[in-house]
Structure formats: structure tokens, C-alpha cells
């Protein structure tokens, strides 16, 4: 949602967290601002304190409950407001009617581990974190491998168009250090975006056996 020179963007992690970023052109005085969440069909409401992440943007996480609790559904609409203190009052700086399952960004995949490694291949698995059971198998993944002398940005993206929590990396160089990352995205939601990349998993391929190709 955009109000004048202000931008207010929020994502739902599909379980019990709404993360918001509010940016505003022109520095505000030292004032306290927060995000208020008012669901249309729930008895609870929630607030988080916006904290600066750069000169003109602030962020906060609305914790709606226990990490794996299903706090919202596809029919919920949550009114999200940015409120800033002026005098003794709060001023509405930005507002949006937020449809959680149209604005999804899952948590980064976790528990990355090497299942099996060879000279030219490596099998890696991972788990998804705090993802709603509503998705069933309707998830996709992107993975990337960091080779020596390259940057993450240069790494080609490998796309997994189904809920597959493992990958077999091929055509690797023997006895070489690599790093691997993966991210996840539900197929649902007009404004849904990729999760952050997972923590990188470092692994090393096996050295080639002398006089023998494995």
C-alpha cells in the first residue's frame, strides 16, 4: 500500500507471523511508530514496534501466536495500520486491508544436510519451517550452488517445480569446496514472493581416486 511518499509492505509466513516494512521519504523526527493488526473475524489484535533498518525504512514482526499455530486462513482480512506518535495521539501513516494468503513469504528452509557426497555428485536434503498444512504439496523451490571463484549472484538457479525437499547436484568438480542454498515459495497468492535464502550449507566433493573414475 502506498500513501503519498510512503510504502507499506507486509508478508504472512503462513502460520503465526506477519513481517512488515514501512518506508517514508523525508526523515521523521525521533518518534515512535508501530504496526497494528486488526483481523476482521478474530478476537485478537496485535502490535509491533517499528525499528529502523535504514535511514528511511522501518521494520517489525507481528507475532500472532506459537510459531507453528495456524492463526489465519484464506478467508481472513487483516487491517494493518502504521501508527506514529504525535503529541499524545497516534497518527495513521499508512493503512492496508491485508489478505494473508495473497501475500505469502515463507520462512527460509532449515536443517540443510548432505545426505551423500561423491566426487562429482552431492545429494542434499532440507526441511521447510512453519509452513501451513493448507499448501499440501503446492510449493516450489529454487536452489543455487556457489562454486569457487564465483559469487552467489552468478550462480545458476535450479528450479524444483514441486514439493521436493532434496536435490542431487551433478557435474561437480572433485575435491572442491562448494556452498548450497535453497528457498521456497507457495504457488498460491497474487503478491506471494520467495522466502529468504536458507543459511548456506558448505560441503566438499570427494577427491578423485587415482587411476579410477567414480
Amino acid at each position: 500500500a502506498v500513501n503519498g511518499t510512503s510504502q507499506f509492505t507486509c508478508f504472512y509466513n503462513s502460520r503465526a507471523n506477519i513481517s512488515c516494512v514501512w518506508s517514508q521519504d523525508g526523515a521523521l523526527q525521533d518518534t515512535s511508530c508501530q504496526v497494528h493488526a486488526w483481523p476482521d473475524r478474530r478476537r485478537w489484535n496485535q502490535t509491533c514496534e517499528l525499528l529502523p533498518v535504514s535511514q528511511a525504512s522501518w521494520a517489525c514482526n507481528l507475532i500472532l501466536g506459537a510459531p507453528d499455530s495456524q492463526k489465519l486462513t484464506t478467508v481472513d482480512i487483516v487491517t494493518l495500520r502504521v501508527l506514529c506518535r504525535e503529541g499524545v495521539r497516534w497518527r495513521v501513516m499508512a493503512i492496508q486491508d491485508f489478505k494473508p494468503f495473497e501475500n505469502l513469504r515463507l520462512m527460509a528452509p532449515i536443517s540443510l544436510q548432505v545426505v551423500h557426497v561423491e566426487t562429482h555428485r552431492c545429494n542434499i536434503s532440507w526441511e521447510i519451517s512453519q509452513a501451513s498444512h493448507y499448501f499440501e504439496r503446492h510449493l516450489e523451490f529454487e536452489a543455487r550452488t556457489l562454486s569457487p571463484g564465483h559469487t552467489w549472484e552468478e550462480a545458476p538457479l535450479l528450479t524444483l517445480k514441486q514439493k521436493q525437499e532434496w536435490i542431487c547436484l551433478e557435474t561437480l568438480t572433485p575435491d572442491t569446496q562448494y556452498e548450497f542454498q535453497v528457498r521456497v515459495k507457495p504457488l498460491q497468492g497474487e503478491f506471494t514472493t520467495w522466502s529468504p535464502w536458507s543459511q548456506p550449507l558448505a560441503f566438499r566433493t570427494k577427491p578423485a581416486a587415482l587411476g579410477k573414475d567414480t
Epitope: 500513501n3 499524545v88 495513521v92
Partner: antibody, heavy 121, light 112 residues
């Protein structure tokens, strides 16, 4: 029905203090702000500041800082405005007015009937 | 502080005729949230002020539709389409965009 009932007229000597009360009814006192506005005889309106009864937080117009004190007693849904070091220019009608804690639409919707304060030696 | 200047100071009108009051602010009163907190109050003789219009053009509940507000930036207008006897009094504009909030000096509407 929302009502703000203010205390009666006061006559004070220069240098003295005056304390005006504003009793609220018809709504939850701690959910709204109470603003104070004054109107000198034949003059316009001047916003003095406000108090949020929910936590007692106050904000004063710079013009009155150091001379004005706003307080509240939630047990009797009453807000108070005290003005000290009175001078003849403080002769005015003092109004309390209700305002939304979240300023989304308007500053003040319901007003008290006003309290006349006369400063004279 | 934002200075609000109203004109005219006095406005004699004929019953049933339109009336227009101008309010000019010394600086732009668009708040950083892109809203303009310009309000109009009516003060009938011997009474407290009463909210008529908020956010430039929105009528407060119970306000007759003969009252309308318009304007933007620094120039605002309150119009009464057909003046009635009960409209006599002083009208004040008010800005709530920049603290300290300030009122205009008032315009006295009287019947000719």
C-alpha cells in the same frame, strides 16, 4: 450521549493559578484524548494542548509550556487544566474537547460548555 | 507555527442565498501521510464550537448537506449553499496536520 461538563466561572488575581475541571460521561473516558482550547474575549480559538487519560501522557503547546499542567482522575472521569502565573491576557473562556486517541479523521468532536476565567486585580 | 488566515472577517448574507468563507494556511498542510487535516468549526452565539467538516470536505455526522468544504495545499473554502437563520455565528478553520494545531481568526456570518 457524550457530554463534557466543565466547572463554573472563576475570578483570579494576576500571578495566581486557576484549575478548571471537565467531567466526561457517555463514553469510555480512558479511550479518548481531552484537548484544551481557549478563547480570549472577542478573539479566536487557541489550542493549549491535551492529555490522554488512559496513561496520563500530556502534550503542551510551546506557548503555554511551563505555565500549564493537565491532569486527570480516571476514577471520576474528570480531566483538569491548571494555568499558573495568570496575567490579564489569560482572561478567556476555556474549553475542553474530546478527541480520538488515533487521529485518523478529526482532532476534536465534542466540546464542553466552556469555563470563563477572569484575571483582574 | 502554521498561521491560518480567514477572509472575510465579517460576512453579511441574505437568507436563502449562498455564502463562502476562505481559509489560507501559511504553509502546505498536507501531512506526511498524504492526508490534509483541515477542519471547520461553527460557533453559534453563546455556544461552544461544533465540528462541521473534517479532512477538507467530509461532513461530520448530523451536519446538514448545505455545508460543503473544498480546497487543497494552502487554500480552502467553506460553502453554505443556502443560508438559514440557524447558521448565524462565527466559523473557524483549523489545521491538525502540524503540531501545534492552529485555528483561523474566524469569520462572522450574520443576516443582512
Amino acid at each position: 450521549e457524550v457530554q463534557l461538563v466543565q466547572s463554573g466561572a472563576e475570578v483570579k488575581k494576576p500571578g495566581a493559578s486557576v484549575k478548571v475541571s471537565c467531567k466526561a460521561s457517555g463514553y469510555t473516558f480512558t479511550d479518548y484524548v481531552i484537548s484544551w482550547v481557549r478563547q480570549a474575549t472577542g478573539q479566536g480559538l487557541e489550542w493549549m494542548g491535551e492529555i490522554y487519560p488512559g496513561d496520563g501522557n500530556t502534550y503542551y503547546n510551546e506557548m503555554f509550556k511551563g505555565r500549564v499542567t493537565m491532569t486527570r482522575d480516571t476514577s471520576i472521569s474528570t480531566a483538569y487544566m491548571e494555568l499558573s502565573s495568570l496575567r490579564s491576557e489569560d482572561t478567556a473562556v476555556y474549553y475542553c474537547a474530546r478527541g480520538s486517541y488515533t487521529y485518523d479523521n478529526y482532532a476534536m468532536d465534542f466540546w464542553g460548555q466552556g469555563t470563563t476565567v477572569t484575571v483582574s486585580s | 507555527d502554521v498561521v491560518m488566515t480567514q477572509s472575510p472577517l465579517s460576512l453579511p448574507v441574505t437568507l436563502g442565498q449562498p455564502a463562502s468563507i476562505s481559509c489560507r494556511s501559511s504553509q502546505n498542510i498536507v501531512h506526511s501521510n498524504a492526508q490534509t487535516y483541515l477542519e471547520w468549526f461553527q460557533q453559534r452565539p453563546g455556544q461552544s464550537p461544533r465540528l462541521l467538516i473534517y479532512k477538507v470536505s467530509n461532513r461530520f455526522s448530523g451536519v446538514p448537506d448545505r455545508f460543503s468544504g473544498s480546497g487543497s495545499g494552502t487554500d480552502f473554502t467553506l460553502k453554505i449553499s443556502r443560508v438559514e437563520a440557524e447558521d448565524v455565528g462565527v466559523y473557524y478553520c483549523f489545521q491538525g496536520s502540524h503540531i501545534p494545531w492552529t485555528f483561523g481568526g474566524g469569520t462572522k456570518v450574520e443576516i443582512k
